[in-house]
């Protein structure tokens, strides 16, 4: 009786079974009752990375400089090439097909997380205490200065954008 | 149990043809692929043509395609291998094999076919 | 076509001895070979296929090894009865193809 169902990496073709091709190979023909799957290497720039009966090899993606795009890890005949983006740069989706310049956080705002080559800056408000008077992508909100431990006195109250101003303390006359 | 017994060889003449036959018996001839290969008088085997179960597919080596045909009848469970244009380099014991496993498991005791003039 | 080379040609050996058969392949068949037997006046016999797997009825003293380009068959102890030609032969593509033999004879 000729099968129905193929063991695990095999397939059905013609009333028989017939091995899939390893990762790195392209199927070149069927087997038959005489011969099994012929198989070739994948070439140069191209890849395969299941077991298949794929007739053509996959091109390596092509991490274009002119997206902003370097490669992170170089394909092999069984993986693909993987891009990142260059410095100051990050990916627009999961696939890294395209990259935009890092988010800068604007004043009143501080660095909460440094963008990676596939995540964006994230911003926070700078709390009470705190400011910001830079748009940055690196820099986090920093401290009030503390006029009492130089002995001085606030002169100008500091806001999420401003410092404060310190001052000398009125002396008495 | 499985047996193959070829018949039809002989002295021919090149150019001549000749018909050479293949009655199977001991298993579901109807089943396997089938095989017929040669074997030059004190030389190595050589493969000479296949056909698959149902005789849909035949497959030849470039030294005999368009000379050779072989074929089958699964009703009278018997192999068949047409010759034709035959030449003394054809001169050989040729044997029929059943593909059993992508293997020839089985083989009969083969037919002498001498090309001579 | 895929060319299957067998050496040594001739292996003279005595009963008992282990003999060890080569069949190299020009390209890589995977492990898409099978060892055959063939006495002197007999048709040849099936002795393992898939480049390892032993036949029923093929006494364990045959053992064939290898995958790639390079093949072995192995006999451990050499009986009489096993002084024949033994032929590779690659179904990893047509044309189906055999290698010369290799005859193992009585020293």
């Known amino acids: 009786e000729p099968p129905t169902a193929c063991r695990e990496k095999q397939y059905l073709i013609n009333s028989q079974c017939c091995s899939l091709c390893q990762p790195g190979q392209k199927l070149v023909s069927d087997c038959t009752e005489f011969t099994e799957t012929e198989c070739l290497p994948c070439g140069e720039s191209e890849f395969l990375d299941t077991w298949n009966r794929e007739t053509h090899c996959h091109q390596h993606k092509y991490c274009d400089p002119n997206l902003g795009l370097r490669v992170q890890q170089k394909g092999t005949s069984e993986t693909d090439t993987i891009c990142t983006c260059e410095e100051g740069w990050h990916c627009t989706s999961e696939a890294c097909e395209s990259c935009v310049l890092h988010r800068s956080c604007s004043p009143g705002f501080g660095v909460k997380q440094i963008a990676t080559g596939v995540s964006d800056t994230i911003c926070e408000p700078c709390p009470v205490g705190f400011f910001s008077n830079v748009s940055s992508a690196f820099e986090k909100c920093h401290p009030w200065t503390s006029c009492e431990t130089k002995d001085l006195v606030v002169q100008q109250a500091g806001t999420n954008k401003t410092d404060v101003v310190c001052g000398p303390q009125d002396r008495l006359r | 149990e499985v047996q193959l017994v070829e018949s039809g060889g002989g002295v021919v003449q090149p150019g001549r043809s000749l018909r050479l036959s293949c009655a199977a018996s001991?298993?579901?001839?109807?089943?396997?692929?089938m095989s017929w290969v040669r074997q030059a008088p004190g030389k190595g085997l050589e493969w000479v043509a296949s056909?698959?179960?149902?005789?849909?597919?035949?497959y030849y080596p470039d030294n005999v395609k368009g000379r050779f045909t072989i074929s089958r009848d699964n009703s009278k469970n018997t192999l068949y291998l047409q010759m034709n244009s035959l030449r003394a380099e054809d001169t050989a014991v040729y044997y029929c094999?059943?593909?059993?496993?992508?293997?020839?498991?089985?083989w009969g005791q083969g037919t002498l076919v001498t090309v001579s003039s | 076509e895929i060319v299957l080379t067998q050496s040594p040609a001739t292996l003279s050996l005595s009963p008992g001895e282990r003999a060890t058969l080569s069949c190299r392949a020009s390209?890589?068949?995977?492990?898409?070979l099978h060892w055959y037997q063939q006495k002197p006046g007999q048709s040849p016999r099936l002795l393992i296929n898939?480049?390892?797997q032993s036949i029923s009825g093929i006494p364990a003293r045959f053992s064939g090894s290898g995958s790639g380009t390079d093949f072995t068959l192995t006999i451990s102890s050499l009986e009489p009865e096993d002084f024949a030609v033994y032929f590779c032969?690659?179904?990893?593509?047509?044309?189906?193809?055999f290698g010369q033999g290799t005859k193992v004879e009585i020293k």
């Open positions: 094999t059943r593909a059993g496993g992508k293997a020839m498991d089985y």
């Open positions: 001991g298993f579901t001839f109807s089943n396997y692929g």
């Open positions: 056909i698959s179960s149902g005789g849909d597919d035949t």
């Open positions: 390209q890589s068949i995977r492990d898409n």
């Open positions: 898939y480049a390892s």
């Open positions: 032969q690659q179904f990893n593509s047509w044309p189906l193809t």
